[in-house]
Interface confidence: medium
């Protein structure tokens, strides 16, 4: 059953979810609810696990509600045995472990007309295993906060994570067992089988010819006998015969007849002729003795001075009689001459299947393992041999023993470790089986006996300088306050690095910003704007390139300010009639010195190199395999000695060739088997072993024996506009744009009007790498100053 217990409720203002008061109006002064409190009760809906909880739909696992259990705020944690705050949802199905729970707090209207109103609702999706332990959950958002606890318990005799394993102890015809904590049947002593209803027979009892209904018994089938039902019963009256199957009489050597009672070798069996007489078999049970000289009688037993020849063996004493002699034998011997060892094993005195060994004047029993004593009549203590490996104790049973295993072990000798890993480990953790326990190996970021807990990496407060820590799976993130950066907010941000201030201004770092101290001619946050001195100070036009203005920065009290019409690459030269010309720096040309002279016009780069125009200079980007200022030098690809096993290296363009010796193969003579390996063909080429050589099939954009040379096809036809230079880059290309142009294919005109070069509200007209100022009325000059 699923149980839920309400622990506490906090609804300080006595409000409903919709903002209204439970009991009517609000106090106009403090806006708190007045009059009576909420009459709080709870509804519960339990359903299948939903990753995104939907309020509707059936409560497929059950639903229920409490009576009114309190007002606005109450605490029931101390009240034990009070069932009013408990909802029990029995289930008649296997518990699925994962679930979604909807808990709603309601205000009872105590009115048949007015419906009840919802105060607050909580939803929780999770996984819970059956246990006596409660799991506490909290609803901490919204108008009301409440706390409740849940658990799942199995009915009596039901076990397992799904409460679907049934086990009820019994000791009757149908079974003899108890139940362990996992619901597994543990058989009582002497019983076995899945239902513990098969008796364990006497140890050694023949499985084929014996059986038992009670432990330790061994009942024989018809035709079989013995303690273990392993001996067949021969034909009744069988004398010198044995059986392999019941009722047989298979004669021993020299015996005949239906009951094996006819001696076919009387001489051999009885050796009746004494004193060296020779015996002859004359028929079944018949014989004849021919005696040596000095002896007579049917058995040559009559002798004159018979004791002279020491006829009594084995220390027997001889007495002469009228018939010849008589031997008085020492203990253990018999027969007329004391030569027969008395068979002390007849009858067999050895119990419990012991084997009798005849000795002189005695016998010895060789007992089966479970028995001991002179005649195997005593039960052997098997526990003396310490057969139990991991056990609390060893119990000696009649003809057997029992090991009482330590927790976590099983098997007759407690030598099998029980596998305690039953899927308890969560979040993809792996389980290690221990003795009477298990251990979950958590993936990074999780902890707890079952890896059920996301480790709070923020617990050690790793964020410095007031940074806010956000816990994530197996990591954390610091949200830094203004002025700090770094993964732990450990870096005090230097807003002056790199220096944002232009035109030689000094930068000063502040807690969350920077300040630029501008030189006299510049202004703006980054000192990027030329000051319009004429707005603040009267100035005098000297010529079409220069104005003068009063200044206390110079000894003469006058500062001369030059026009910037010629841009950064030229100087303004005043001409008569208000005109001007520009004197250009090396490498630039054009009216405003805005054009970079093309130093690549003479095509200085060799061997397919690409020329990039600079300022009064150029740079060659060489094709693969070439180097030098003009790409004039073939790179020596043999310099690293790539050929193994005595191979000779020949340098090619951006490649090398190994002349292999002694049966070595491959690009670098590294293999006995194949011309190809993963490094033979470059840039995604596929290698084919052609016996004496290899061949590379190159992807688009590459060619050469090992796909090492970029095809120029990506730059043909030239995709770069406005005089841009195309540089091959594998299957792709890069455009190096001329000044005044930008974008991936140099199609966008750079905005030369940024930042505002025209003063006094003049309008800027952008050209191709130049601009023109159209001045407002009353202003003139290239930059309207």
């Amino acid at each position: 059953q699923f149980e839920l217990e309400i622990l506490s409720m906090q609804n300080v203002n006595g409000e409903l979810q919709n903002g209204n008061c439970c009991g009517g109006a609000r106090n106009p002064g403090d806006r708190k609810c007045t009059r009576d409190e909420c009459d709080t009760y709870f509804k519960v809906c339990l359903k299948e696990y939903q990753s995104r909880v939907t309020a509707g739909g059936p409560c497929s696992f059950g639903s229920g509600s409490t009576p009114v259990i309190g007002g606005n705020t109450f605490n029931l944690k101390a009240s034990r045995g009070n069932d009013r705050n408990r909802i029990v949802l029995p289930f008649s199905f296997a518990w699925p472990r994962s679930y979604t729970l909807l808990v709603e707090a309601w205000d009872s209207s105590n009115d048949t007309v007015q419906p009840d109103s919802i105060i607050e609702k909580a939803s929780h999706s999770g996984m819970i295993n059956p246990s006596r332990q409660w799991q506490t959950l909290k609803q901490n958002t919204g108008v009301a906060h409440f706390e409740y606890q849940i658990r799942v318990t199995c009915d009596d005799y039901y076990y397992g994570f799904g409460c679907n394993k049934f086990c009820r102890p019994r000791d009757d015809f149908f079974g003899h067992y108890a139940c362990d904590q996992n619901g597994n049947k543990t058989c009582m002593e002497g019983w076995m089988g899945p239902e513990c209803n098969r008796a364990i027979c006497r140890q050694g009892c023949s499985p084929k010819h014996g059986s038992c209904k009670l432990p330790g018994d061994c009942r024989c089938q018809y035709g079989w006998q013995g303690l273990y039902c392993d001996k067949c019963i021969p034909h009744p009256g069988c004398v010198h015969g044995i059986c392999n199957e019941p009722w047989q009489c298979l004669c021993e050597t020299n015996w005949g007849g239906q009951l094996c009672d006819k001696d076919l070798n009387y001489c051999g069996t009885h050796q009746p002729c004494l004193n060296g007489g020779t015996c002859s078999n004359t028929g079944p049970d018949k014989y004849q003795c021919s005696c040596p000289e000095g002896y007579s009688g049917p058995n040559c037993e009559i002798a004159e001075h018979a004791c002279l020849s020491d006829p009594c063996h084995n220390r027997g004493s001889c007495k002469e009689t009228s018939l010849g002699f008589e031997c008085e034998c020492s203990p253990g011997w018999t027969g007329p001459t004391c030569s027969t060892n008395i068979d002390d094993c007849s009858p067999n005195n050895c119990s419990h299947g012991g084997t009798c060994q005849d000795l002189v004047n005695g016998f010895k029993c060789v007992c089966p393992p479970q028995w001991t004593g002179k005649t195997c009549q005593l039960d052997a203590n098997e526990c003396e041999a310490k057969p139990c490996v991991n056990a609390k104790s060893c119990k000696n049973l009649i003809a057997s023993y029992y090991c009482d295993c330590l927790p976590g072990w099983m098997g007759q000798n407690c030598d099998i470790n029980i596998n305690d890993c039953l899927g308890q480990c969560q979040n993809d953790a792996s389980c290690r089986d221990l003795v009477n326990g298990y251990r979950c190996i958590c993936p990074p970021g999780y902890a707890g006996d079952h890896c059920e807990r996301d480790i709070d990496e923020c617990a050690s407060n790793p964020c410095l300088n007031g940074g806010h820590c956000q816990n994530e799976i197996n990591r954390f993130q610091c949200l830094c306050p203004t002025g700090f950066s770094g993964n732990l907010c450990q870096l005090d941000i230097d807003y002056c690095e790199p220096n944002p201030c232009q035109n030689g201004a000094q930068c000063y770092n502040r807690a969350s910003d920077y300040f630029c101290k501008c030189p006299e001619d510049y202004e703006g946050k980054n000192c990027s704007h030329l000051k319009d001195h004429c707005r603040t100070t009267p100035c005098e036009v000297i010529d079409s390139c220069t104005v003068a203005m009063a200044s206390n920065d110079t000894p003469e009290g006058v500062r001369y300010i030059s026009s910037n019409v010629c841009g950064p690459h030229g100087k303004c030269k005043s001409q008569s009639g208000g005109k001007f010309t520009c004197d250009c720096n090396k490498g630039f040309t054009g009216t405003y010195c805005h054009e970079n002279i093309n130093d690549c016009e003479s095509n200085p780069c060799r061997n397919g190199g690409t020329c990039i125009d600079g300022v009064n200079s150029y740079k060659c980007i060489c094709s693969d395999g070439w180097e030098g200022a003009y790409c004039e030098t073939n790179i020596n690809d043999c310099s690293q000695n790539p050929c193994h096993n005595g191979g000779t290296c020949r340098d090619l363009v951006n490649d090398f060739y190994c002349d292999c010796k002694n049966g070595w193969k491959g690009k670098t003579c590294h293999s006995r088997d194949s011309q190809c390996d993963e490094a033979t063909c470059n840039n995604g080429g596929t290698c084919y072993d052609e016996g004496d050589a290899f061949k590379c099939m190159c992807p688009g954009g590459w060619e050469g024996t090992t796909c090492n040379i970029a095809r120029n096809s990506s730059c043909l036809p030239n995709p770069c506009h406005n005089g841009g230079t195309c540089v091959v880059n594998g299957e792709s290309f890069t455009c190096v744009c001329k000044e005044g142009w930008e974008g991936p294919i140099c199609a966008q005109n750079t905005n030369d009007c940024s930042p505002h070069p025209c003063y006094n509200s003049g309008t800027c007209v952008d050209g191709d790498n130049w601009y023109r100022c159209e001045c407002a009325p009353g202003f003139a000059g290239p930059d309207c100053r």
Epitope: A429, R432, L434, V435, G437, R439, C440, I441, C442, P443, P444, Y446, A447, G448, D449, C451, R453, I455, A459, S460
Partner: antibody, heavy 117, light 111 residues
Framework: EVQLLESGGGLIQPGGSLRLSCAAS????????MTWVRQAPGKGLEWVSV???????FYADSVKGRFTISRDNAKNSLYLQMNSLRAEDTAVYYC???????????WGQGTLVTVSS | QAVVTQPPSASGTPGQRVTISCSGS????????VSWYQQLPGTAPKLLIY???QRPSGVPDRFSGSKSGTSASLAISGLQSEDEADYYC????????????FGGGTKLTVL
């Protein structure tokens, strides 16, 4: 801030008993795996015992039957009861929090146990 | 008795990259995650690497770990004088009923 502080070490005769304590702050002992690790003078680290949050305990073969690990949830403390001490038990004993992995993310400063006659 | 082997000593000059190896068997390193610890003279060990290659917060990215088969290694790049310490690897050992087994330790000297 997480902290572990061991105490209870000292000089003891062979065959004697000693109880080490480890007071924890900044986290709850009962909901974590807690371990004792020792280091003999001039030697390497040796794992001694662990108690799981569920209460299961495990010991190294060298101390099994002589040492007992336990905890007091109310005091948020870990203990190691050491009986039948031998000269080879001389070491600095550290308590550490063991995360499933296993790895030890927080260690105490250690307490020295000297077993000598 | 299960054994995890580390070289007794290693050395390097400042700025160099040094690697310390840790060799075990299928019952420990082969089937379980490896962690690494730094022990400065006279102090308690400190966690450097867990789960083979994960770095706890506060450990510089100069320290990195890796594992292959029954061996693991700790790499320290841009060696500094304060890295002079003893380094230990550790892993569970299944044959010891889940006991943790430490390597013998490696003394790193910065020349």
């Amino acid at each position: 801030e997480v902290q572990l502080l061991e105490s209870g070490g000292g000089l003891i005769q062979p065959g004697g008993s000693l109880r080490l304590s480890c007071a924890a702050s900044g986290f709850t002992v009962s909901s974590n795996y807690m371990t004792w690790v020792r280091q003999a003078p001039g030697k390497g680290l040796e794992w001694v015992s662990v108690i799981y949050s569920g209460g299961n305990t495990f010991y190294a073969d060298s101390v099994k039957g002589r040492f007992t690990i336990s905890r007091d949830n109310a005091k948020n403390s870990l203990y190691l009861q050491m009986n039948s001490l031998r000269a080879e038990d001389t070491a600095v004993y550290y308590c550490a929090r063991e995360m499933s992995g296993p790895y030890f993310d927080y260690w105490g400063q250690g307490t020295l146990v000297t077993v000598s006659s | 008795q299960a054994v995890v082997t580390q070289p007794p000593s290693a050395s390097g000059t400042p700025g160099q990259r040094v690697t310390i190896s840790c060799s075990g068997s299928s019952s420990n390193i082969g089937s379980n995650p490896v962690s690494w610890y730094q022990q400065l003279p006279g102090t308690a060990p400190k966690l450097l690497i867990y789960s083979n290659n994960q770095r706890p917060s506060g450990v510089p990215d100069r320290f990195s770990g890796s594992k292959s088969g029954t061996s693991a290694s700790l790499a320290i790049s841009g060696l500094q004088s304060e890295d002079e310490a003893d380094y230990y690897c550790a892993a569970w050992d299944d044959s010891l009923n889940g006991d943790v087994i430490f390597g013998g330790g490696t003394k790193l000297t910065v020349l």
